[in-house]
Amino acid sequence: MNKQRGTFSEVSLAQDPKRQQRKPKGNKSSISGTEQEIFQVELNLQNPSLNHQGIDKIYDCQGLLPPPEKLTAEVLGIICIVLMATVLKTIVLIPFLEQNNFSPNTRTQKARHCGHCPEEWITYSNSCYYIGKERRTWEESLLACTSKNSSLLSIDNEEEMKFLASILPSSWIGVFRNSSHHPWVTINGLAFKHKIKDSDNAELNCAVLQVNRLKSAQCGSSMIYHCKHKL
Amino acid sequence: MAVFKTTLWRLISGTLGIICLSLMSTLGILLKNSFTKLSIEPAFTPGPNIELQKDSDCCSCQEKWVGYRCNCYFISSEQKTWNESRHLCASQKSSLLQLQNTDELDFMSSSQQFYWIGLSYSEEHTAWLWENGSALSQYLFPSFETFNTKNCIAYNPNGNALDESCEDKNRYICKQQLI
């Protein structure tokens, strides 16, 4: 309940999670259909199957070959016409696509599950968090998070710790040591710099986030765990 | 005459070439823009190969806000009066929390803080109303009949609600609906 520095003015972006997984599965990209059409046109332009035999025959009948400059101009003219049509089509199509749910800026799009985090996870400052309700040992928690394609909760800074502490109960974090003679390390093997309370107790070799501070605990005890996935 | 014709065709070819090039570059720019604007990332489902697009702003909340189930929430750490809280939320183009159901904030059901929410008593309608004017469902807070109508409501995400003086200072939750 103590007053803390307001963070109201520092607003920028964290993603909303719910809308993942509701997207039609087939398309890799929402514009694939249209873009395939556009690219089809472009590909056709790269190898224009313009049948010049007819033209050649006319010239042959007259006993004359057309100057190459004229042929080039004709080909370029046709390419110009096709390109012009493609450009116009594209100009018309893009706003149409945007109006029809394909744009991330439309309200309809926002109803979808966007893909930042799995459903029922929360997003905060470019990370996804799984808020666990079940209790596990530290090792079981580590495995549970791995199976969710994420890591056991890590604390990157004081601000994140304050935020998490305000909404979560005690939770395992991804920090441990082999014994009280060894340094605290993260699950990535990096040295952990922050102070961990009760580090002098040889039986307590796994770390817990507990209301605004970090403390050591018995790795075999059961605690709630949370997972984190950086975006 | 033949030379003149050749020169003319060359001129036409050159002009058409330039037009073609400019059309090609226009098309390229249009396509690039359409790609950037329209691409939507694949769903992040718990599974082996997760590909995340960092730069997409789709369904995103402001920094320091929490995204959950199509909504953005600002969970304050500072304590304010009910009116101050309401104005702070409004200044962020949001409103004090309006609950759809008691498990809406189940991601923070372990929190033991009470937060101001956007519920106040309307003498005119003789009912507890949310900020958008809709009435409080009698199923949301079974104890709401005992609330003092002069007070404002502080809510704990565990489902508890208290009526307290609107001049009291509590933390607060702002909400932005993305749909």
Epitope: K3, V211 | Q113
Partner: antibody, heavy 120, light 107 residues
Framework: EVQLLESGGDLVQPGGSLRLSCAAS????????MHWVRQAPGKGLEWVST????????YYADSVKGRFTLSRDNSKNTLYLQMNSLRAEDTAVYYC?????????????WGQGTLVTVSS | DIQMTQTPSSVSASVGDRVTITCRAS??????LAWYQQKPGKAPKLLIY???SLQSGVPSRFSGSGSGTDFTLTISSLQPEDFATYYC?????????FGQGTKLEIK
């Protein structure tokens, strides 16, 4: 360092009145709810009353409702408990306690207590 | 009102023992529970809050667990200074209520 110092405890006759004070220091007083808890001689702890940080809302145990009034003066960092219509069963050591920052329903710092004796 | 029942009401133990005190709520209180230690003539001291969070400055031999209606305070290895009376308290709703206390005595 958080300090809570109660005063005002005394021997009073049934039906009489007493005003207890609790002077707080070492923390930002107006950020926290405050409580009174009492303990009858040789008995357990009993919650008496709670006041919110700005003093706008008070909560009372049924046993004291209508007789006790809790207030605070944030400018003086002081908590008051006005006790009227005192009864023999109000005899106890009265502790003033600070609310925990994690949740106001926990009492993280206590005063040393002041003894109120109601007897004829 | 929520009733809090502590068991046992008293327990005798020796230094180095592991001691467990239980507290039961008459209705679910999630994890809104605290444990206090009180020595004769002194004010109570907060040990555990939110069922399992250790209050700052409290030795790690004290731990709390439980949720809903059943809660436990454990002292892993009893020290001479731990002989006192222990109370549980629910903070889920007004009126806040305490257990009747468990007196921990030297065997």
């Amino acid at each position: 360092e958080v300090q809570l110092l109660e005063s005002g405890g005394d021997l009073v006759q049934p039906g009489g009145s007493l005003r207890l004070s609790c002077a707080a220091s070492g923390f930002t007083f107006d950020n926290y709810a405050m409580h009174w808890v009492r303990q009858a001689p040789g008995k357990g702890l009993e919650w008496v009353s709670t006041i919110t940080n700005s003093g706008g809302t008070t909560y009372y145990a049924d046993s004291v409702k209508g007789r006790f009034t809790l207030s605070r003066d944030n400018s003086k960092n002081t908590l008051y408990l006005q006790m009227n219509s005192l009864r023999a069963e109000d005899t106890a050591v009265y502790y003033c306690a600070k609310a925990h920052y994690y949740a106001r329903g926990y009492f993280d710092f206590w005063g040393q207590g002041t003894l109120v004796t109601v007897s004829s | 009102d929520i009733q809090m029942t502590q068991t046992p009401s008293s327990v005798s133990a020796s230094v180095g023992d592991r001691v467990t005190i239980t507290c039961r709520a008459s209705q679910g209180i999630s994890s809104w529970l605290a444990w206090y230690q009180q020595k004769p003539g002194k004010a109570p001291k907060l040990l555990i809050y939110a069922a399992s969070s250790l209050q700052s400055g409290v030795p790690s031999r004290f731990s709390g667990s439980g949720s809903g209606t059943d809660f436990t305070l454990t002292i892993s290895s009893l020290q001479p200074e731990d002989f006192a009376t222990y109370y549980c308290q629910q903070a889920n709703s007004f009126p806040y209520t305490f257990g009747q206390g468990t007196k921990l005595e030297i065997k």
